[in-house]
Amino acid sequence: GSERTCCPVNWVEHERSCYWFSRSGKAWADADNYCRLEDAHLVVVTSWEEQKFVQHHIGPVNTWMGLHDQNGPWKWVDGTDYETGFKNWRPEQPDDWYGHGLGGGEDCAHFTDDGRWNDDVCQRPYRWVCETELDKASQEPPLL
């Protein structure tokens, strides 16, 4: 595939990545799939600066990110190491709360109204953020 050198229309560039901010809500799995179909992934927060950038764009609204523990340990969707990486959980979170009455615990992470993270039921229809890296090979075939 060809190397992407600039962000698609309606995406925002920041530090060699492109971001797309939804204005509607989807369950985590549907949001994850949406980003994959755009040759991207749910946002992976790796630094103080990236947290601040995303926080500015989403405002005080619950928004999915690419972090989940549906298979046990917490994992970033792009393989970034969770244990050694940036974290910004709210106090007492994640708590895998079962008291919501929706069945199961809480396996998907989202930005809360103050930007800090919470785990929640993955079926909740929250906004989401897609991210794709510039300089990575896109899946589109090269033009002949």
Epitope: Q51, F53, K87, G115
Partner: antibody, heavy 118, light 107 residues
């Protein structure tokens, strides 16, 4: 009321170590990130370090990286700054401050003075 | 590192004057800028966060504005207790950095 009280300052020789403490009261200490900020005599404010509420992230100023360590004991409502390989330029009033939203500092202690001199 | 530059470094004003202090960042910090007030021998006091939000308990004569790289702190009608040093601080990127300060003195 919300209060931060620093202690542990004093006169120390270059190359030696010192540990500062900051005792918090009047708020849920374990829910807030905490900072150390310093001010050299007659100079402006210089940020030193921050630690997350749960200790999951720590960041340092370049001038102290590798020499200073920020830590906390939430069971004791206390913040610490371990300072080693001290230099004359580390002479300052050291303040602890409560974090507001990754970087803002809404509550400050009264400061403790560190003097590095032979 | 992001450099924060304040101007002027000092100013003389009278009670009742409108005072404006500028703060410029060496790169875009969006709106991640705070203002503090410090009086001699005292700890700094938090005034304004995210460029324009007034901290609880701070008098409404204080206001902040700006985004990107240029920011302003305004005191609409200077009071005797406002004579102090004012610092801006960026929180967009680590290391966190302060401006050099602006000393507001009595004319």
């Amino acid at each position: 009321q919300v209060q931060l009280v620093e202690s542990g300052g004093g006169v120390v020789q270059p190359g030696r170590s010192l540990r500062l403490s900051c005792a918090a009261s009047g708020f849920t200490f374990s829910s807030f990130g905490m900072h150390w900020v310093r001010q050299a005599p007659g100079k402006g404010l210089e940020w030193v370090a921050i630690i997350w509420h749960d200790g999951s992230n720590k960041y340092y100023a370049d001038s102290v990286k590798g020499r200073f360590t920020i830590s906390r004991d939430n069971s004791k409502n206390t913040l610490y700054l371990q300072m080693s390989s001290l230099r004359a330029e580390d002479t300052a009033v050291y303040y602890c401050a409560r974090d507001l939203s990754m970087g803002g500092m809404d509550v400050w202690g009264q400061g403790t003075t560190v003097t590095v001199s032979s | 590192d992001i450099q924060m530059t304040q101007s002027p470094s000092s100013l003389s004003a009278s009670v009742g004057d409108r005072v404006t202090i500028a703060c410029r960042a060496s790169q875009n910090i969006i709106s991640y800028l705070n203002w503090y007030q410090q009086k001699p021998g005292k700890a700094p006091k938090f005034l304004i966060y995210t460029a324009s939000s007034l901290q609880s308990g701070v008098p409404s004569r204080f206001s902040g504005s700006g985004s990107g790289t240029d920011f302003t702190l305004t005191i609409s009608s200077l009071q005797p207790e406002d004579f102090a040093i004012y610092y801006c601080q960026q929180t967009y990127s680590t290391p966190l950095t302060f401006g050099g300060g602006t000393k507001v003195e009595i004319k």
